[in-house]
Interface confidence: medium
């Protein structure tokens, strides 16, 4: 099932999704598109990522944290009521059955009367936590040998959590790191 | 050498559970996804589960969905199938076997191991 | 319930050939080329003998070879030899991103 996030018209529309490399520059592929996660790739893709850079957007699709530290959360601007829906986050893991995919259902409401907050960055829903493997310490990391060399860490995201939108804003800004292992 | 040495299996009584371990060695166990299969006695190899490196997507066939449920420990280069509500149909010889990274196969697997579900 | 149909057996002589048939449908055989064979004895695990429609590992020999045309894939075994007898498993990723297995073939030498 998607954890679902919420923006309002006009604002920006922020859907987490995050992986840790075991160092800058040794990136996975990652791909966001509308619609949920088909079997590869992404359908409808909006933005992609390769080894190395941003290889691929379109208009009002960004990543505003820092991809190449694993932060490739999606950022859809001046979001209107035709952005809802299904989004998939698909961290492209070498083999079958190994990719990282995630749905996010974004849910946009119509804008408020009152005005916006001065802070104009949209944490919509929950900040995303970690999965941790049930017995051991906070949380896993995968190493892939002899494949790029990641821990990959992608979290998965919970809307139930830190719903408070300017916590999740207080947190990222005091430079809270989440990261497995 | 990749080695798998599963264990775990048992006589097991209607609606009851198991927990099916398969200890991996010889490969880098966090960077390759996992899979059971099963045979049950005089029958084909039936493909049940599939967990991905990172063991946080888990896969399952129709069959058992709800009942079944994968897990890995990549610290302890484990992999577990845990069954529930064990039914008669359930009988066969579970295999853990390790997904090739480059091709859609199973290159290497476990010796096997017997659950038998009956009263 | 096997998704994919495998004939029941085949036999064939020494040093002949025989061809082992697999189908599926477009969304498993004939949309991926991800289908397998595998090659079990009798009380034994299973053992790979084709990847990827017709990629063999390395220690498989050469008389094992696979080919797919539409949805159905095939496996040959040329010069058939003795411990060449015994049940193969054909098996292809699916769109559900599953796996699934042909019910076996029982190959024979006579």
């Known amino acids: 099932s998607e954890v679902e996030y919420r923006a309002e018209v006009g604002q920006n529309a922020y859907l987490p999704c995050f992986y840790t490399p075991a160092a800058p520059g040794n990136l996975v592929p990652v791909c966001w598109g509308k619609g949920a996660c088909p079997v590869f790739e992404c359908g409808n893709v909006v933005l992609r990522t390769d080894e190395r850079d941003v290889n691929y957007w379109t208009s009002r699709y960004w990543l505003n944290g820092d991809f190449r530290k694993g932060d490739v959360s999606l950022t859809i601007e001046n979001v209107t009521l035709a952005d809802s829906g299904i989004y998939c986050c698909r961290i492209q893991i070498p083999g079958i059955m190994n990719d990282e995919k995630f749905n996010l259902k974004l849910v946009i409401k119509p804008a408020k009367v009152t005005p916006a907050p001065t802070r104009q960055r949209d944490f919509t829903a929950a900040f995303p936590r970690m999965l941790t493997t049930r017995g051991h310490g906070p949380a896993e990391t995968q190493t892939l040998g002899s494949l790029p060399d990641i821990n990959l860490t992608q979290i998965s995201t919970l809307a139930n959590e830190l719903r408070d939108s300017r916590l999740a804003n207080d947190l990222r800004d005091s430079g809270a790191t989440i990261r497995i292992g | 050498q990749v080695q798998l040495v599963q264990s775990g299996g048992g006589l097991v009584q209607p609606g009851g559970s198991l927990r099916l371990s398969c200890a991996a060695s010889?490969?880098?166990?966090?960077?390759?996804?996992m899979s059971w299969v099963r045979q049950a006695p005089g029958k084909g190899l039936e493909w049940v589960s599939g967990i991905s490196g990172s063991g946080r997507t888990p896969y399952y066939a129709d069959s058992v969905k709800g009942r079944f449920t994968i897990s890995r420990d990549n610290d302890k280069n484990s992999l577990y199938l845990q069954i529930t509500s064990l039914r008669a149909e359930d009988t066969a010889v579970y295999y853990c076997a390790r997904n090739d990274i480059f091709t859609g196969s199973l290159p290497d697997w476990g010796q096997g191991t017997l659950v038998t579900v009956s009263s | 319930s096997y998704v994919l149909t495998q004939p029941r057996s085949v036999s064939g002589s020494p040093g002949q050939s025989v061809t082992l048939s697999c189908t599926g449908t477009s969304s498993d055989v004939g949309g991926y080329n991800y289908v397998s064979w595998y090659q079990q004895h009798p009380g034994k695990a299973p053992k790979l003998m084709i990847s990827d429609v017709s990629a063999r590992p390395s220690g498989i020999s050469n008389r094992f070879s696979g080919s797919k045309s539409g949805n159905t894939a095939s496996l040959t075994i040329s010069g058939l030899q003795a411990e060449d007898e015994a049940d193969y498993y054909c098996s292809s990723f699916t769109s559900s991103s599953t796996y699934v297995f042909g019910a076996g073939t029982k190959v024979t030498v006579l």
């Open positions: 010889g490969f880098s166990f966090s960077t390759y996804a």
